[in-house]
């Protein structure tokens, strides 16, 4: 082609028209084009209808094109990936009718201030949605209802002050949630539902530690090993979980998971008032509970965690184990850190290893090239995640360009993955990192393999194992510019359980007393 570079790889015909100072779609492109790169041009406005002749088009990169308007007309029946990051869009086009097969949508780093009701209607195949770096203050109720297959959601670096209580309802495959660097002060009760969320990025928000935060505290404790800090330029493999990164804004950066909740209403003699009644549509069967677990089976008793009552307010083992400073650097928009796929039942990790064909393009902002999906611990045969199909472990798209490192840097201070629970009011034998046991379970962290027979292991939650798990790896998707939920090698660090809606959770985590 006279203007663009055409290459054929296997059955894909890739056309690279990046950085050609184009103001419109070049004429006479090959009709069987499957991947089209139009990044870093000067399109300003673009009509998807102009691509209708390209009936095999599966990936379209329109990032960094100074787009202020995207006209959605016609239909691109097989387009699966659309990158609109780093443009000037002030509203999200209604893509459902035009792009019914869309699986990855990246609208990061635009100028979105709000999303309309039904913004995602018709996008029933969507698996990854990247909205990082916009100016969103609120989200419409039911925003994600049309996207039940969603696996990765990045809302990082916006101005969100609150989240709809049912935002995640029905998202049984969600394995990566990036909410860092917003203005969130609390999490609605039951927000996370009953599924294990393998990778959660929650730091950089002004969490208000009062009685309303107890549900979130319990959730953090239950999911301590699934909470990470995003850092640009750090290989996902180097990431470790750091539940202490979620800090009270009103208490000198005290970790939310250790907030004592003294004086808060209790149910009976203990426990928060938000019991089961707040459980959002729990999947009691657990068909789709995601749980990241490293699969090394430990002795049954796995020495009681030293934490005994792990949450004792005074105990700081978790904190000490985790990096204290957690402000991640800017995420590179295109870092392709791959996240370990969510563990699926039988540890068949379906990490859809969808590597975006979209080749990371070096754009004005260099973004790390996608690294290979981070090794995922081998799934434990028994563990099932409630339905987590590993979602592609791809860096969150269009995070701000970061150096090529695809995996987020470890939190400011890499927190050792404390395998041994910190002692709590009642010291339980601190299980030092459990020894891997023969029973394969999803090995999320390199050291700890949960011998979870069916524990749902988050796709990447415990990807602490440095050795790639064949299953996981095979299932991983590498997504360029993922907010980079780094290939979180979930180093089990926080041994805190966060219980969300857990009726049993006593509000005063501060002092977990032995049962």
């Amino acid at each position: 082609h006279p203007i663009c570079e055409v290459s054929k790889v296997a059955s894909h015909l890739e056309v690279n028209c990046d950085k050609r100072n184009l103001t419109a779609l070049p004429p006479d492109l090959p009709k069987d084009t499957t991947i089209l790169h139009l990044s870093e041009n000067l399109l300003y406005t673009f009509s998807l209808a102009t691509l209708m002749p390209y009936t095999r088009l599966t990936q379209l990169n329109l990032d960094r094109c100074e787009l202020t308007k995207l006209q959605v007309d016609g239909t691109l029946p097989v387009l699966g990936t659309l990158d609109l990051s780093h443009n000037q869009l002030q509203s999200l086009p209604l893509l459902g009718q035009t792009l019914p097969a869309l699986t990855v949508l990246d609208v990061s780093f635009n100028r979105l201030t709000s999303l309309p009701l039904g913004a995602l209607r018709g996008l029933g195949e969507l698996q990854e949605l990247y909205l990082k770096g916009n100016e969103l203050k609120t989200l419409p109720p039911g925003l994600l209802t049309p996207t039940p297959k969603l696996e990765k959601l990045s809302l990082a670096n916006n101005n969100l002050t609150e989240l709809p209580a049912g935002l995640l309802n029905g998202l049984e495959n969600l394995d990566t949630l990036l909410l860092q660097e917003n203005s969130l002060y609390t999490i609605p009760k039951g927000f996370f539902g009953s599924h294990l969320l393998p990778f959660a990025f929650l730091h950089g928000n002004p969490w208000l530690c009062n009685c309303e935060i107890l549900y979130f505290r319990r959730w953090l404790q239950d999911n301590a090993e699934n909470v990470y800090v995003w850092k640009q330029g750090v290989d996902v493999k180097a990431m470790t979980s750091n539940v202490a990164s979620v800090q009270c804004d009103n208490s000198d950066k005290f970790p939310v998971y250790k907030y004592p909740g003294k004086g808060c209403p209790t149910l009976g003699d203990e426990g928060d008032t938000d019991l089961y009644d707040y459980y959002p549509e729990e999947d009691t069967e657990g068909d789709k509970v995601r749980a990241t677990r490293t699969v090394v089976k430990f002795p049954t008793k796995a020495h009681t965690t030293p934490w005994g009552l792990f949450y004792s307010w005074s105990t700081a083992s978790l904190d000490s184990q985790m990096p204290s400073s957690l402000h991640p650097t800017q995420e590179s928009t295109k870092e392709q850190t791959t996240f370990p796929p969510r563990w699926t039942p039988n540890f068949t990790l379906h990490m859809e290893s969808i590597t975006f064909s979209k080749t990371p393009k070096s754009t004005t902002e260099p973004t790390p090239s996608p690294t290979t999906s981070e090794p995922v611990p081998e799934p434990a045969p028994n563990m099932t995640t409630l339905e987590p199909t590993p979602s592609p472990t791809t860096p969150e798209p269009t995070s701000e360009p970061a150096p090529s490192p695809t995996t987020p840097e470890p939190t400011s201070e890499p927190a050792p993955s404390p395998t041994t629970p910190e002692p709590t009011s009642e010291p339980a034998p601190s299980p030092t990192t459990p020894e891997p046991t023969p029973i394969p379970t999803i090995a999320t962290s390199p050291t700890i393999l949960v011998s979870a027979t069916s524990l749902i292991t988050p796709k990447s939650t415990f990807l602490t194992t440095t050795k790639p798990v064949s299953l996981l790896e095979s299932t991983k998707k590498t997504i360029p510019e993922l907010d980079q939920p780094p290939k979180l090698r979930g180093v089990l660090q926080g041994h805190l359980e966060s219980s969300r809606n857990d009726p049993f959770l006593h509000p005063d985590f501060c002092c977990l007393l032995p049962l």
Epitope: E270, T441, L512
Partner: nanobody, 123 residues
Amino acid sequence: EVQLVESGGGLVQAGGSLRLSCAASRRTFSNYVMGWFRQAPGKERESVTAIGRSGTILYADSMKGRITISRDNAKNTVYLQMNSLTPDDTAVYYCAASSGSMQQFWRMEYDYEGQGTQVTVSS
């Protein structure tokens, strides 16, 4: 010392159901991840299910879709409903409590565990 007492086990025919209960002696029950593991004769222990303080739930693949865990903090009790039982489900079922995370529980890092209740599924 926390005491965990299981009940509800017994002999059932293949395809049948059982509901196991685990009563805890302390009111601090809500501070723990609770769940069940099992051990069949000549086999290693395996995690069956767990429920966190916040309601996060994990199930083993081998019993996925056939079991449901729930807890009643007011009664300091956790329940395991098992349906469509097969002879392979024959084992001693133990209740356990962990003050750590869900992952720790799944790794069998328990603070407390009960004496177990026998479940026998005949063909």
